[in-house]
Interface confidence: low
Amino acid sequence: VPDKTVRWCAVSEHEATKCQSFRDHMKSVIPSDGPSVACVKKASYLDCIRAIAANEADAVTLDAGLVYDAYLAPNNLKPVVAEFYGSKEDPQTFYYAVAVVKKDSGFQMNQLRGKKSCHTGLGRSAGWNIPIGLLYCDLPEPRKPLEKAVANFFSGSCAPCADGTDFPQLCQLCPGCGCSTLNQYFGYSGAFKCLKDGAGDVAFVKHSTIFENLANKADRDQYELLCLDNTRKPVDEYKDCHLAQVPSHTVVARSMGGKEDLIWELLNQAQEHFGKDKSKEFQLFSSPHGKDLLFKDSAHGFLKVPPRMDAKMYLGYEYVTAIRNLREGTCPEAPTDECKPVKWCALSHHERLKCDEWSVNSVGKIECVSAETTEDCIAKIMNGEADAMSLDGGFVYIAGKCGLVPVLAENYNKSDNCEDTPEAGYFAIAVVKKSASDLTWDNLKGKKSCHTAVGRTAGWNIPMGLLYNKINHCRFDEFFSEGCAPGSKKDSSLCKLCMGSGLNLCEPNNKEGYYGYTGAFRCLVEKGDVAFVKHQTVPQNTGGKNPDPWAKNLNEKDYELLCLDGTRKPVEEYANCHLARAPNHAVVTRKDKEACVHKILRQQQHLFGSNVTDCSGNFCLFRSETKDLLFRDDTVCLAKLHDRNTYEKYLGEEYVKAVGNLRKCSTSSLLEACTFRRP
């Protein structure tokens, strides 16, 4: 089979027939050097998954539950292309599983025990697997058989397709539990009718069900959604209040050598020629031989899944948790009102050493997880492998887009009630050598630049945002002659000045010597023309305050700031000569860990914060010899956010807008993946 062949896996005679037709029609429209289709027939989806893993086939389209199976070892498949529904302009690749209740019913998600429940059907995603998976650890023991545990949890249910003889409580609200539309409470609309009629207290459906059944907004306003954080929201706020976000139908391939680009090329060309309303003789999204063959008949087209997205990220933390609970049936030993250890994400070797020291000193309250880049850390927090880390504002933005929330802010100024008063922020500055007297903000083109890292606030988002407004393109590697911006593409001119050795060159972690505030300033000292850092960086690394050989003899007076009006000022005049005010670094976590991270970190800073006077013999949370490990070294305390508890509110409208503008220039594969899940 030539290399440009995609071997599609079919699971029935009808699918195999459609696959052959797909193959023949593609041959007629695609040049001979383009992608082609071959068909492989297997008995089931699980057999297809195994065949792809074994390199006997390349692709198959799966429902969300099977995407989870495909991801599990030893299969290790990943999503590569998503079907979308609705219009090309507003493509829907996911639906939201929600818990709908009547407005005046007055209970929350953690108070469902003893209520009456309406389900779309036993074993169905939104109506059963997701809600029951998420409630699994609240079900009374023994939790097997599952139907019995559910029957004992709710005071009565309608769960179509359940066995009414063995589990009569599951059919209490719909006698007989009929498994078709003959049962008025079957399916999405049926489960909603069960709630509407007053038979049940809660209906587990998908977000569109309410809109499909109630055209009138005034009628919809009589209902609310239960959120996982034990609040309620209006039914149109399903994106912020759901049980899980579920992909509809997805093409999977091998994670390694999986031909994902070829599969996309094939399907993209296929939708051009044979998509909705394109061709009479062959249609990708319908078939005379049966329903939903190879692809869903209701699909309108395909979207490429961003390459950074593995199955865990694609399915989402809530969905994976629900399905894992159902499949594995394991629940934590700790009582639910007690906090489990917080798993801190540490970047590379240096942070891990400090984190391990913290872990030992915390006596089991902190555990450590390692990752090579900040984005890898954010991904680990998203999928539950880690719980928290402190981030620069640029990454708070990405984390926020990925569904994480800020919990505490680093404060850098000593004050009486430090923990109660989050600060307005710090200043992002452009530093130059005093000796380069002709250099101004207006003539930086062609100069050598030093950045903390791509995507960070003072080192990238603020200066590059301002620059973008001036040059109106993203080709910053053309604007500067060379530079060090850790996280850039390795062959970019913005990696040329970096000092990391081998694979560590230009890496966005401490293995790259020019990474971070101190690193960017060192880059200026040794090689560059301008460094983009925070206002405290120069004083923290001059006048003998940084004992490292490169810094120990530096004098603050030898450096100046570039002002946006084209003038220059001494370093201490940062308040009147800066690029913008930057939001302080903040600790982020998942919504479900917010309370525990807040509680444990406040305990930890009371034990190891700035009140510790001697850091030579004791562990100090906010010290690391100017390396800014885990937290910035100038942190005085971690402060409560009060009502600034979302990434937008924390960062502020102006900064969110600035980073939003730079989105056109974003090289963040994680941001691309997260905005695929939530545009």
Epitope: D90, N472, H473, R475, S492, K657, N661
Partner: antibody, heavy 120, light 113 residues
């Protein structure tokens, strides 16, 4: 599907201000993309005027910056062009358009255009 | 400001003929980092607004017939219609989006004999 519709006066006197509205249906202007104004002179020459991004950020053609602004009303899903101190040189068909995000500035949806004559 | 020069300014062809029009840029529109040419082609039929045909110099917009082909790199670009149909009677414009502000060519008017 996405549709854009321009509206505004057909005739404006010199030195007055010109205000045009673009009403977008089928897509929220805060959800993504940049939303542009372009004009076409009677001799068919096309000139890009500026855009407002979904985030609210604006960008204008340097030749018109001083007498030109683009604003929006997100509740009505509309964006606006205001051109001050018009002269007969501003007689043109004015189009609103959306860019394809990738690539930026390549307009994949256009309104049908509204013709404005500047004359006393 | 980048200037785009289109030629010819007009041409008349018979249905079924192949037609080629060119667009020259005053500076290169090729960005070395991603090897993409920042050029688009539009078709404007009489009394209608422009319609995007080609972007990145050679990528056809969804729904555009494959008789339209964009080619070229750097400063010289070509739009080819392999077999002209009567409905192709239009003015064709090139547009650069490499450098701010984006600019358009003066157009090539295609007439049918």
């Amino acid at each position: 599907s996405v549709q854009l519709q321009e509206s505004g006066p057909d005739l404006v006197k010199p030195s007055q201000s010109l205000s045009l509205t673009c009403t977008v249906t089928g897509y929220s202007i805060t959800s993504g993309y940049s939303w542009h104004w372009i004009r076409q002179f009677p001799e068919n020459k096309l000139e890009w005027l500026g855009y407002i991004h979904s985030s609210g950020a604006t960008n204008y053609s340097p030749s018109l910056k001083s007498r030109f602004s683009i604003t929006r009303d997100t509740s009505k899903n509309q964006f606006f062009l205001q051109l001050n101190s018009v002269t007969t040189e501003d007689t043109a068909t004015y189009y609103c358009a959306r860019d394809g995000y990738s690539p930026p500035y390549a307009m994949d949806y256009w309104g049908q255009g509204t013709t404005v004559t500047v004359s006393s | 400001v980048i200037e785009l020069t289109q030629s010819p300014s007009s041409l008349a062809v018979s249905v079924g003929e192949k037609v080629t029009m060119t667009c020259k840029s005053s500076q290169s529109l090729l960005y070395s980092t991603n090897q993409k040419n920042y050029l688009a082609w539009y078709q404007q039929k009489p009394g209608q607004s422009p319609k995007l045909l080609i972007y990145w110099a050679s990528t056809r917009e969804s729904g555009v017939p494959d008789r339209f082909t964009g080619s070229g790199s750097g400063t010289d670009f070509t739009l080819t219609i392999s077999s002209v149909k009567a409905e192709d009677l239009s003015v064709y414009y090139c547009q650069q989006y490499y450098s701010y502000p984006p600019t358009f060519g003066s157009g090539t008017k295609l007439e049918i004999k």
